[in-house]
Interface confidence: low
C-alpha cells in the first residue's frame, strides 16, 4: 500500500526573465527514492537518479539547473513557460508518486507565490 504524500510548492507565479525553484517533498513513507523525473506536460526536463546523479534534457540545458536538493531551478523565464510541471518520484517498493505544480509567468512585477498543498 502506498502511504506517502507529495508536498509541492503548489500554484506559483514569477516574473518574465526571472527564475523560480520547483520543489517537491515526499513524506509519510519509508520507501527508497530511486529516481525523480521533472516533466513539463509531456516533455522531460530533468532526471535525478540515485545511482547516476543529475541529467538535464539537452533542449533545456541553458535554462534549467539542478537543485536545490531534488528540486529544479528554471531560469530566464518566458511567458511560454507558463503551465503544469510534474515531479515524478520513483520509489521502491511503493512505486510512483506524482506531484503537480502550476507556474504562471507574468509580464508585470507582481508575482505572488501560492499556498503549498498536498497530493496523496
Amino acid at each position: 500500500m502506498m502511504t506517502g504524500t507529495i508536498e509541492t510548492t503548489g500554484n506559483i507565479s514569477a516574473e518574465k526573465g526571472g527564475s523560480i525553484i520547483l520543489q517537491c517533498h515526499l513524506s509519510s513513507t519509508t520507501a527508497q527514492v530511486t529516481q525523480v523525473n521533472w516533466e513539463q506536460q509531456d516533455q522531460l526536463l530533468a532526471i535525478c537518479n540515485a545511482d547516476l546523479g543529475w541529467h538535464i534534457s539537452p533542449s533545456f540545458k541553458d535554462r534549467v539547473a539542478p537543485g536545490p536538493g531534488l528540486g529544479l531551478t528554471l531560469q530566464s523565464l518566458t511567458v511560454n513557460d507558463t503551465g503544469e510541471y510534474f515531479c515524478i518520484y520513483h520509489t521502491y517498493p511503493d512505486g510512483t508518486y506524482t506531484g503537480r505544480i502550476f507556474l504562471e509567468v507574468l509580464e508585470s512585477s507582481v508575482a505572488e507565490h501560492g499556498a503549498r498543498f498536498q497530493i496523496p
Epitope: 516533466e39 522531460l44 532526471i47 541529467h55 520513483h90
Partner: antibody
C-alpha cells in the same frame, strides 16, 4: 581492443555457491559501471543490477537481493558475481556488460562478456 | 519498473525485406532506448542507443526512431546475417528489456 572475458561454465548442486568473474581490458576499468544480466534457457534478458567501479557501490534489481553479491578487484580490472544457496531456477547464462558511462545519456550496454553458463542440478 | 512491450514476438521475412520492430514503454522514457541483436549462443550486441544513434561499426541498414512511449527498429534490407533476436532496452531508469523479437527466415 576493449573486451570483457568471463570465467568458464559451472555445474553446481543445489545449495552450493558460485562466483563468476568478468575481466576487463582495453579501457580504464573504473571509468565505466559494470552490469550483470541473466538469461534463463530460452528466455529473454533480465537486468540483475550494476556496480559502480569507482566506489564499489552495488545496486541490485528487484528479485536479486540477498543471495546475489557484486564485487570488484580493481587491481586486476575484474568484476565478480557471487550467488549463494543456488537453486535450480538459477540455471542460466550470466553476462557482464559495460555501461557507456556514468550519466543517464550513456546508460546503454556497449560491451558484453561472452557469458558464463551456470547449471544447477542435483 | 518501466515495462517494455515488443511486437511482434516472431517475424518471418526474406533476404532483402524491409523489417520493422516496435517497442512500447509503459511510461514516457524520452529517447532513452537502446536496441540489441542476439544470435544463438552469443552475447547481445548494441545496435542503436539514444533511440536513433547508430553504434560505431553497425551497418547503416539498421535505424531507430521514436520518442516518449513508442519506438521502432528498422532493417531497410534484411541480410542473411540479420536473422537473430532483437531486444529493446530502456535506460532512463533501472534498466529493463523488452521480451524480444525473433526474426526468422521465411
Amino acid at each position: 581492443q576493449m573486451q570483457l572475458v568471463q570465467s568458464g561454465s559451472e555445474l553446481k548442486k543445489p545449495g552450493a555457491s558460485v562466483k563468476v568473474s568478468c575481466k576487463a581490458s582495453g579501457y580504464t576499468f573504473t571509468s565505466y559501471p559494470m552490469n550483470w544480466v541473466r538469461q534463463a534457457p530460452g528466455q529473454g534478458l533480465e537486468w540483475m543490477g550494476w556496480i559502480n567501479t569507482n566506489t564499489g557501490n552495488p545496486t541490485y534489481a528487484q528479485g536479486f537481493t540477498g543471495r546475489f553479491v557484486f564485487s570488484l578487484d580493481t587491481s586486476v580490472s575484474t568484476a565478480y558475481l557471487q550467488i549463494s544457496s543456488l537453486k535450480a531456477e538459477d540455471t542460466a547464462v550470466y553476462y557482464c556488460a559495460r555501461t557507456g558511462g556514468y550519466s543517464v545519456d550513456e546508460y546503454s550496454f556497449d560491451i558484453w562478456g561472452q557469458g558464463t553458463t551456470v547449471t544447477v542440478s542435483s | 519498473d518501466i515495462q517494455l512491450t515488443q511486437s511482434p514476438s516472431f517475424l518471418s521475412a526474406s533476404v532483402g525485406d524491409r523489417v520493422t520492430i516496435t517497442c512500447r514503454a509503459s511510461q514516457g522514457i524520452s529517447s532513452y532506448l537502446a536496441w540489441y541483436q542476439q544470435k544463438p549462443g552469443k552475447a547481445p550486441k548494441l545496435l542503436i542507443y539514444a533511440a536513433s544513434t547508430l553504434q560505431s561499426g553497425v551497418p547503416s541498414r539498421f535505424s531507430g526512431s521514436g520518442s516518449g512511449t513508442e519506438f521502432t527498429l528498422t532493417i531497410s534490407s534484411l541480410q542473411p546475417e540479420d536473422f537473430a533476436t532483437y531486444y529493446c532496452h530502456q535506460t532512463i531508469f533501472r534498466p529493463t528489456f523488452g521480451g524480444g523479437t525473433k526474426v526468422e527466415i521465411k
